[in-house]
């Protein structure tokens, strides 16, 4: 590497890279400055003068250290669905993700740009697996024994209450009723909730999301209103 | 949502090789600086490669240059680190990271990897 | 190569205490230096950049300052959380290098 008395631009010696915060310059052959986030380079540098910088204009920015000519723009303004979990700054893109009870269908690398509703469960039907950021919620019809009477994104399949006399026995969409005796064992009587997904602010706090069981094919999937899957509503 | 995961590393015999890699998701793998840095057992970090967000720039410290090499496939979103001749004092926890801004500040750091000495 | 030497090594201190520990390079680095977090087990992670930038999510009890050859980190209200490493590092120039380490515990 070049003694640290060198000032930019300078010529690297042979088999050396230029020093952080630096890049070389095909056309000069010379280590030249970079720009910092938030500027970009207004004039390339010659072998007598080093970059100059320039800040990036509104609604666009620059995330790194870099040479670029101009500051990239910010992505378009969050829809109807989404939060804006991330502002657009010199120094950074918009970030949108999605809404509590929706989830992203399609991801990019940063954010999300398709958000979908979470599936919910209709009667008879409870939550196997709660939705994530990431992936929709999957139902199940209730087990003997079990029953849900509600359409729900957090509900799950709860336990019949057990009477000593039964008036009307239970369903997987309706609880045991009882005759006026007491019953010997009764669940609670609010419905078991599973959490819904958060959406965070940082990137670096995020609980990892359980990876979808269904194939990433978002993609290719019509943009309008699909049919409900089995227990769901579209609700 | 940004995760990096480093492969397994494990034992080598002293003069041995092995390659390790890093899968990247949640962020633009491609315009990342990247870096690989160690930590022997119960001893602190040490610094040990970087590559530029295009593969072109790649740096050593001296411990391990002429040894180890590190690279990128930015088509399959990951990291490598070649390391021949490997020698007892290269026994260490080995970490993946991403640098926020192309200016060796580590802001994302893959779970580790031991690679270990089986002599 | 630029040595980095953090002081002290280890420390103990109350939950509620203020916390410094110090971090001295052999030349001058700007502003060029960041401090970082570990946990037993655990990878390291980034709290302050560039000397005094709080990194996103992380708490504000966190702080750093100084620049040139020396930098303070500090925590305002130690919590039972913060029992972990910190390290400090130095991006001014190449080889990247961190200081030794500071351990703190609580009392």
């Known amino acids: 590497l070049p003694a640290q008395v060198a000032f930019t631009p300078y010529a690297p010696e042979p088999g050396s890279t230029c020093r952080l915060r630096e890049y070389y310059d095909q056309t000069a052959q010379m280590c030249c400055s970079k720009c910092s986030p938030g500027q970009h380079a207004k004039v390339f540098c010659t072998k007598t003068s080093d970059t100059v910088c320039d800040s990036c204009e509104d609604s666009t920015y620059t995330q790194l250290w870099n040479w670029v000519p101009e500051c990239l723009s910010c992505g378009s303004r969050c829809s109807s669905d989404q939060v804006e979990t991330q502002a657009c700054t010199r120094e950074q893109n918009r970030i949108c993700t999605c809404r509590p009870g929706w989830y992203c269908a399609l991801s990019k690398q940063e954010g999300c740009r398709l958000c979908a509703p979470l599936r919910k469960c209709r009667p008879g039907f409870g939550v196997a697996r709660p939705g994530t950021e990431t992936s929709d919620v999957v139902c199940k019809p209730c087990a003997p024994g079990t029953f849900s009477n509600t359409t729900s994104s957090t509900d799950i399949c709860r336990p019949h209450q057990i009477c000593n006399v039964v008036a009307i026995p239970g369903n997987a969409s309706m609880d045991a009723v009882c005759t006026s005796t007491s019953p010997t064992r009764s669940m609670a009587p609010g419905a078991v909730h599973l959490p819904q997904p958060v959406s965070t602010r940082s990137q670096h706090t995020q609980p990892t999301p359980e990876p979808s069981t269904a194939p990433s094919t978002s993609f290719l999937l019509p943009m309008g209103p699909s049919p409900p899957a089995e227990g769901s509503t579209g609700d | 949502q940004v995760q990096l995961l480093e492969s397994v590393g494990g034992l080598v015999q002293p003069g041995g090789s092995l390659r390790l890699s890093c899968a990247v998701s949640?962020?633009?793998?491609?315009?990342?600086?990247m870096s690989w840095i160690r930590q022997a057992p119960g001893k602190g970090l040490e610094w040990v490669s970087i590559i530029s967000d295009g593969g072109d720039v790649t740096v050593y410290a001296d411990s391990v240059k002429g040894r180890f090499t590190i690279s990128r496939d930015n088509s399959k979103n990951t990291l490598y680190l070649q390391m021949n001749s490997l020698r007892a004092e290269d026994t260490a926890v080995y970490y993946c990271?991403?640098?926020?801004?192309?200016?060796?500040?580590?802001?994302?750091w893959g779970q580790g990897t031991l690679v270990s000495d089986s002599s | 190569d630029i040595q980095m030497t953090q002081s002290p090594s280890s420390l103990s201190a109350s939950v509620g205490d203020r916390v410094t520990i110090t971090c001295q390079a052999s030349q001058d680095i700007t502003n060029f230096l960041n401090w970082y977090q570990q946990k037993p087990g655990k990878a390291p992670k980034l709290l302050i950049y560039?000397?005094?930038t709080l990194q996103t999510g992380v708490p504000s009890r966190f702080s750093g300052s100084g620049s040139g050859t020396d930098f303070n980190f500090t925590i305002s209200s130690l919590q039972p959380e913060d029992i972990a490493t910190y390290y400090c590092?130095?991006?001014?120039?190449?080889?990247?290098?961190f200081g030794q380490g500071t351990k703190v515990e609580i009392k």
């Open positions: 990271a991403r640098d926020r801004t192309s200016a060796a500040a580590f802001d994302s």
């Open positions: 949640g962020f633009t793998f491609s315009t990342y600086a």
């Open positions: 590092q130095q991006s001014d120039s190449y080889p990247i290098t």
């Open positions: 560039d000397a005094s």
